[in-house]
């Protein structure tokens, strides 16, 4: 990373250093330490104070983004004296060169696309690179397949999501021969970026008085069970006047996904389609293929 770290410290320095790969802030241990604390302040003056590691000469920041620039601070008291040191972590490089409009989505349960746009002041030879680290920080994933626009990486396709956890850190670095390129970073929850497939195995069975719709929950990247799903059924009578209201039915996920509704014979031709969402987010999938039942002369 091209970020330059500037230290603001008194004469006897703690030698504070920050490793952006592990998000670990460390300093030289002092003898007879009685108190130590570390924290960061971001550009909006929000303070993040993590727990100190056991040896008390380092701390790890779990869920932080650095692209707006932050200031780290370490306070140490020993039985003899007090130490205080600031470490500025700016996002160096020309303003407006970082990747922008960054977003990712998971689809088909095991694929992910991330896209971004070139920074407005980025030079023509800019190249961007995406790195992903999971919340356990055990592994860094480098983008395996870049999507390009005139030779510049503007997206990434991943077909192996095994390294991801429920929350992940995304970093887009940039390089250029002409000038320094700023980085962009973001924390994303997999549950918020997954787009579900529509429900599968949709069937309709009718008897003389009722019709029973059954379906299977979609396969998802997240480990979800039946109560995590909400469904919407669109039961639609065919050949009705334009502007006629469709009947939208909300159904909670269940061990056996089914919806039974009165429909007596002879019944007109109807179609039913279903979509699915996470019950807490209601980010609807696309509709399943319409299934027809009934007859034209009903």
């Amino acid at each position: 990373e091209k970020s330059d770290l500037r230290t603001v410290a008194p004469a006897s320095s703690l030698n504070v250093r920050f490793d952006s790969r592990t998000m670990n802030l460390s300093w030289d241990c002092q003898e007879n330490t009685t108190f130590s604390k570390c924290f960061l302040t971001d550009k909006k003056n929000r303070v993040v104070e993590p727990r100190l590691s056991n040896n008390e000469c380092s701390c790890t920041f779990r869920e932080i983004c650095l692209h707006e620039g932050v200031t780290f601070e370490v306070h140490v008291n020993t039985s003899q004296r007090g130490f205080q040191q600031k470490l500025l972590y700016p996002n160096s490089g020309r303003e407006g060169t970082a990747a922008q409009n960054f977003s990712c989505f998971i689809y088909n349960a095991d694929l992910m696309n991330c896209t971004w746009a070139r920074g407005p002041t980025a030079p023509r030879d800019v190249q961007y690179f995406l790195y992903i680290r999971n919340s356990k920080r055990r592994r860094e994933i480098r983008c395996p397949y870049y999507i390009q626009d005139s030779g510049t990486h503007v997206g990434c396709h991943l077909d192996n999501l095994s390294g991801l956890t429920s929350r992940n850190y995304f970093l887009v670095n940039g390089t250029s021969r002409e000038i320094g390129i700023q980085f962009f970073d973001s924390l994303l929850d997999t549950k918020k970026i997954e787009r579900f497939n529509p429900p599968s195995n949709v069937t309709v069975r009718c008897n003389t008085t009722h019709c029973l719709v059954r379906w299977k929950q979609p396969r998802t990247y997240q480990k979800l069970s039946y109560l995590d799903f909400q469904y919407q059924l669109d039961v639609h009578r065919k050949n009705t006047q334009p502007g006629t209201e469709n009947l939208l039915i909300n159904v909670s996920g269940d061990l056996e996904n089914r919806y039974n509704f009165p429909s007596s014979e002879p019944r007109a031709k109807h179609s039913v389609k279903i979509r699915a969402a996470d019950v807490r987010i209601l980010n609807w999938s696309s509709w399943s293929e319409a299934i027809e039942f009934g007859s034209d002369d009903g």
Epitope: S166, K223, L224, S225, L227, L255, E256, R280
Partner: antibody, heavy 120, light 111 residues
């Protein structure tokens, strides 16, 4: 109709082991996750363990670690709980439950329970 | 001693509204982890009433509702009926214990 059918009541001596079964009907066990919870009049409900999707394995409550084993036979849609080195305070009703959501986790459907009595 | 604290009993006349509190800590309800509520009729297995803090599974009447704030949660039963007489338990996840935790239960009596 999905049901969890548990094995019958057991009486065991201290130091012995007990194996409780939980058969799922109306659904495939391979598509579900089972957890085990016990209930005593004094301690109330105690979670014992079950499948954790983040770890992709069965995890056990710390207090039962080393004494408890949870297994599954998906060919007959049956889950098993084995508790060894039984003590009198293991006398309880043991429930299997289907996880309806891993966020919680939420126990969407419970078996009727198996009464295990530990007495000399 | 249960990790989540509930009153041991509450009572109300038919048609009345009763509420049951469930108090946890920063490692469970306040972490924040979701809260579920279960009803246990005498001599039977527990039945899920509420999940994800305030969602009702299909088949549970809308007389049952729940909410969560900070390190506490509560269950409300409106239009109390004789067959609501049961024990009610709250449940959540606790990060320090790395597993599910339950309340000690509240006996609801319909006067």
């Amino acid at each position: 109709q999905v049901q969890l059918v548990q094995s019958g009541a057991e009486v065991k001596k201290p130091g012995a082991s007990v194996k409780v079964s939980c058969k799922i009907s109306g659904h495939s066990l391979s598509e579900l996750s089972i957890h085990w919870v016990r209930q005593t009049p004094t301690k109330g409900f105690e979670w014992m363990g079950g499948f954790d999707p983040e770890e992709n394995e069965i995890v056990y409550a710390q207090r039962f670690q080393g004494r408890v084993t949870m297994t599954e036979d998906t060919s007959i849609d049956t889950a098993y709980l084995t508790l060894s080195s039984l003590r009198s305070d293991d006398t309880a009703v043991y429930y299997c439950a289907i996880v309806g959501s891993f966020s919680g986790p939420v126990y969407g459907l419970w078996g009727k329970g198996t009464m295990v009595t530990v007495s000399s | 001693q249960a990790v989540l604290t509930q009153p041991s009993s509450v009572s109300g006349a038919p048609g009345q509204r009763v509420t049951i509190s469930c108090t946890g800590s920063g490692s469970n309800i306040g972490a924040p982890y979701d809260v579920s509520w279960y009803q246990q009729l005498p001599g039977t297995a527990p039945k899920l009433l509420i999940y994800h803090n305030n969602k009702r599974p299909s088949g549970v009447p809308d007389r049952f509702s729940a909410s969560k704030s900070g390190t506490s949660a509560s269950l409300a039963i409106t239009g109390l009926q004789a067959d609501d007489e049961a024990d009610y338990y709250c449940q959540s996840y606790d990060s320090s214990l790395s597993g599910s935790v339950f309340g000690g239960g509240t006996k609801v009596t319909v006067l």
